[in-house]
C-alpha cells in the first residue's frame, strides 16, 4: 500500500516518502524508486531557514544604506541577514526595513530610555524635584540643586525645565 | 509523454573516442536525474555512470579514467564520452531515467577495425 | 564496489507452478536514510529491461500481483506464484544503494 502520510522530515510524492532538504539546501530533484532526494546548497547571499522542498532559496535581505541600514548579523545559507540602524536612528518595523531618527526629549522631559537601533527613545515628564532644561535623545531629568547642602537657601523655585536658583542666607546682623 | 533516445555512431575503431548523446522529452534535465547502461552481446547489465539533476556526475570506477558525462539542459541532451575503446566495450548502450521505468531503446556500439 | 550474486542461473519451470529467485549481496543495501535500493528486472530477447520490483518489495505500476519481492540487508527473494509463459526472460536484481550501481548475472527462466 502506498503511504498516505509521512514521518517528520519528510514528504509524500508520487505515493512515495521523500526527505526534506535541511536548511541550506533547495530540492533539485524528488527521491525516485532508485534515489534519495536531490538537494543543492544554496548560492551565495541565498539561505533557506527550514527543512524544505522548495526548488529555490531566499535572497539575503539587503541592508540599504540610503535607508539609514547597516548589517547587525550576515546572513548565512541557513539564516537571513539581519539589518539594523546607523547611530541616531532606529527601525521603523520589527522587520527593520527603514530607519528614522531617534527622538528627542523636549525641555520639561528626560529620557527614560536610550533608543536603540529597534526602539525609539522613551521619554517621561520630569517630575518635581527633576528638571531637563535641553531637548536631548540621551538626557535624563537631573534632579535639582539642593541649596541646603551648600548652606545656600532656594532663591528661585526650581520647575520642571529650571534648577533652582540658590542664593546666600540673609545674616542676623 | 516521457521519451529518451541514444543516437552516436553504430562502429567505431579500437583506440578511439565514442560519442554518444541521449536525447530527451516530456521532462527536464534540471529536474530528472538520467544515467547510462550498457550490455555486451549474450551479457549481462553493466551501470556506466550518472548525471544528475542538479548537474553532478557519478561514475563507474571501471570506467572512470576513460568516461565523460555531460549535459546541455537546453538542448535536453545528456552525453557521454569514452575513450581508447576496445573491443570489450562493443555493447547495447542504454540511457535511463532515475524514476519510474523509462529506458531509450538502446543504440549498438560495436568496437572493431 | 557491491557484488550482486543471483541463484539459480537457470530455472526451468512448469507453466502454472511457483519460481524463485535469490540475490546476495556482498554488503547491506540499506541507506543512511533507512531505505533499501534494492530492484528486480526482467528482460526479454531484443528488448531493454523492464522494472518489476523497486525497493526489495514494491510492485512497479501495470506488473502482475503474481510477482513479489521480499528481503533485507544482503538477501533478497523474488516469487512468482504462478508462472505464465509470458514470463520467460531473463530476471536481473540491482541495487542503487551503492555508487556504482550494480546488477546481478542475471536468471534464466525458462518453461518446460
Known amino acids: 500500500e502506498p503511504p498516505t502520510a509521512c514521518r517528520e522530515k519528510q514528504y509524500l510524492i508520487n505515493s512515495q516518502c521523500c526527505s526534506l532538504c535541511q536548511p541550506g539546501q533547495k530540492l533539485v530533484s524528488d527521491c525516485t524508486e532508485f534515489t534519495e532526494t536531490e538537494c543543492l546548497p544554496c548560492g551565495e547571499s541565498e539561505f533557506l531557514d527550514t527543512w524544505n522542498r522548495e526548488t529555490h532559496c531566499h535572497q539575503h535581505k539587503y541592508c540599504d544604506p540610503n535607508l539609514g541600514l547597516r548589517v547587525q548579523q550576515k546572513g548565512t545559507s541557513e539564516t537571513d541577514t539581519i539589518c539594523t540602524c546607523e547611530e541616531g536612528w532606529h527601525c521603523t518595523s520589527e522587520a527593520c526595513e527603514s530607519c528614522v531618527l531617534h527622538r528627542s526629549c523636549s525641555p520639561g522631559f528626560g529620557v527614560k530610555q536610550i533608543a536603540t537601533g529597534v526602539s525609539d527613545t522613551i521619554c517621561e515628564p520630569c517630575p518635581v524635584g527633576f528638571f531637563s532644561n535641553v531637548s536631548s535623545a540621551f538626557e535624563k531629568c537631573h534632579p535639582w540643586t539642593s541649596c541646603e547642602t551648600k548652606d545656600l537657601v532656594v532663591q528661585q523655585a526650581g520647575t520642571n525645565k529650571t534648577d533652582v536658583v540658590c542664593g546666600p542666607q540673609d545674616r542676623l546682623r | 509523454q516521457v521519451q529518451l533516445q541514444e543516437s552516436g555512431p553504430g562502429l567505431v575503431k579500437p583506440s578511439q573516442t565514442l560519442s554518444l548523446t541521449c536525447t530527451v522529452s516530456?521532462?527536464?534535465?534540471?529536474?530528472?536525474?538520467v544515467y547510462w547502461v550498457r550490455q555486451p552481446p549474450g551479457k549481462g547489465l553493466e551501470w556506466i555512470g550518472m548525471?544528475?539533476?542538479?548537474?553532478?556526475?557519478d561514475y563507474n570506477p571501471s570506467l572512470k579514467s576513460r568516461l565523460t558525462i555531460s549535459k546541455d539542459t537546453s538542448k535536453s541532451q545528456v552525453s557521454l564520452k569514452l575513450s581508447s575503446l576496445t573491443a570489450a566495450d562493443t555493447a547495447v548502450y542504454y540511457c535511463v531515467r532515475t524514476d519510474g521505468d523509462y529506458w531509450g531503446q538502446g543504440t549498438l556500439v560495436t568496437v572493431s577495425s | 564496489d557491491i557484488v550482486m550474486t543471483q541463484s539459480p542461473l537457470s530455472l526451468p519451470v512448469t507453466p502454472g507452478q511457483p519460481a524463485s529467485i535469490s540475490c546476495r549481496s556482498s554488503q547491506s543495501l540499506a541507506s543512511s536514510q533507512g531505505n533499501t535500493y534494492l530492484h528486480w528486472y526482467l528482460q526479454k530477447p531484443g528488448q531493454s529491461p523492464r522494472l518489476l520490483i523497486y525497493?526489495?518489495?514494491n510492485r512497479f505500476s501495470g506488473v502482475p500481483d503474481r510477482f513479489s519481492g521480499s528481503g533485507s540487508g544482503t538477501d533478497f527473494t523474488l516469487k512468482i506464484s504462478r508462472v505464465e509463459a509470458e514470463d520467460v526472460g531473463v530476471y536481473y536484481c540491482s541495487q542503487s544503494t551503492h555508487v556504482p550501481w550494480t546488477f546481478g548475472g542475471g536468471t534464466k527462466l525458462e518453461i518446460k
Open positions: 548525471m544528475w539533476g542538479g548537474g553532478s556526475t
Open positions: 525497493k526489495v518489495s
Open positions: 516530456g521532462f527536464s534535465l534540471s529536474r530528472y536525474s
